[in-house]
Interface confidence: medium
């Protein structure tokens, strides 16, 4: 399932994926003066099996000067209305992409490719943000965004990242250290089960929701 929207924009920040989920598409875009070869692919697709993921199709660009007399228009697939872009120049923290099953690495560059890559992300994709040069990060939470499916609608979570100019933040040394994504802390209270309800909602999906009640000593 493709994500409907672009990842959120954060002032003075860029985002990048460290690895790409299977199903991700990358447009075959060529730099000015070049075009896709006549029989070339529209996009590369991250595909794979249980043990290995890789990019299907290869992007190939050729000089527009060699164009034959028939004008060729570059069609975009109908479902690719939304353009997800990442700038290739943005340096991000390294990550061992090979350790992420079901993901493809950053595709290697192809000859005469455009300076900006246009990705079409799928549900579950995570992108990471960092401040552009000349700005520093004051982290208030995780600097990442995840595309999630909700109510049949895709949404990107909001990255908790603030980028400010160096001069404004010189009184906050060390604040640019990234924080880990907050995980739910394990419960450690000594609570007893008072009542449990065993009513179950029978559904065609066999999904059930049960509620029960705990009490804890106020501390």
């Amino acid at each position: 399932e493709l994500c409907d929207d672009d990842p959120p924009e954060i002032p003075h920040a860029t985002f990048k994926a460290m690895a790409y989920k299977e199903g991700t598409m990358l447009n075959c875009e060529c730099k000015r003066g070049f075009r896709r070869i006549k029989s070339g692919s529209l996009y590369m697709l991250c595909t794979g099996n249980s043990s290995h993921s890789s990019w299907d199709n290869q992007c190939q660009c050729t000089s527009s000067a060699t164009r034959n007399t028939t004008k060729q228009v570059t069609p975009q697939p109908e479902e690719q209305k939304e353009r997800k872009t990442t700038e290739m120049q943005s340096p991000m923290q390294p990550v061992d992409q090979a350790s992420l099953p079901g993901h493809c690495r950053e595709p290697p560059p192809w000859e005469n490719e455009a300076t900006e890559r246009i990705y079409h992300f799928v549900v579950g994709q995570m992108v990471y943000y960092q401040c552009v040069q000349g700005y520093r990060a004051l982290h208030r939470g995780p600097a990442e965004s995840v595309c999630k499916m909700t109510h049949g609608k895709t949404r990107w979570t909001q990255p908790q990242l603030i980028c400010t100019g160096e001069m404004e933040t010189s009184q906050f040394p060390g604040e640019e250290k990234p924080q880990a994504s907050p995980e739910g802390r394990p419960e450690s209270e000594t609570s007893c089960l008072v009542t449990t309800t065993d009513f179950q909602i029978q559904t065609e999906m066999a999904a059930t929701m049960e509620t029960s009640i705990f009490t804890t000593e106020y501390q």
């Epitope: 995840v146 499916m149 109510h151 739910g184 999906m205 999904a207 059930t208 929701m209």
Partner: antibody
């Protein structure tokens, strides 16, 4: 009043970490109020401004259970509390937990 | 915020019933309708304004987009006497309408 309380909601029959789980309050004789939701996969949580700071929503994905917690109950917290799964609409609901706060 | 009209509706079995829900700003088609019978949990009827949830009788239908939405019951049945809520899920915080109670005339 003043006591802490934690109610729970267990989901089963679907991928618990792939759907938001949320809570709705219904005070006696009143309508439905959306309190907040949590995505158990990564504990991402969103609250209604009306409930931010008043309650805590959490989840334990290892036992497919979401929680709604108060640190200090008030009489005005007396209500029925429903959990729901957030799929195509709030598509599946718990049967509700009645919380009564009285001295 | 969401408003509903009417707040109470008296009707008879077999009647065609229409409930209106208005949003204070455009919510696209991200609207759901719920039915709640006394003492029971709410039940989803419609999602994305006009999509009928599987298992819900076809006498229920929904329409609208933007700021104005309607829920229609083509032929009211005894089981349909309940309170109906609309709810937007276009943006946080998700909000419910105040409800429309459908009772027996």
């Amino acid at each position: 009043p003043g006591e802490s309380l934690k109610i729970s909601c267990k989901g089963s029959g679907y991928s618990f970490t792939s759907y938001w789980i949320g809570w709705v309050r219904q005070m006696p004789g009143k309508g439905l109020e959306w309190m907040g939701i949590i995505y158990p996969g990564d504990s991402d949580t969103r609250y209604s401004p009306s409930f931010q700071g008043q309650v805590t929503i959490s989840a334990d994905k290892s036992i497919s259970t979401a929680y709604l917690q108060w640190s200090s109950l008030k009489a005005s917290d007396t209500a029925m509390y429903y959990c729901f799964r957030f799929g195509e609409g709030f598509d599946y609901w718990g049967q509700g937990t009645l919380v009564t706060v009285s001295s | 915020w969401m408003t509903q009209s009417p707040s109470t509706l008296s009707a008879s079995v077999g009647d065609r019933v229409t409930i209106t829900c208005r949003a204070s700003q455009s919510i696209g088609y991200w609207l759901a309708w719920y039915q709640q019978r006394p003492g029971r949990a709410p039940k989803l009827l419609m999602y994305r304004a006009s999509n009928l949830k599987s298992g819900v009788p076809s006498r229920f239908s929904g329409s609208g987009s933007g700021t104005e939405f309607t829920l229609t019951i083509s032929s009211l049945q005894p089981d349909d006497f309940a309170t109906y809520y609309c709810q937007q899920y276009n943006s946080y915080p998700f909000t419910f309408g105040p409800g429309t109670k459908v009772d027996i005339k």
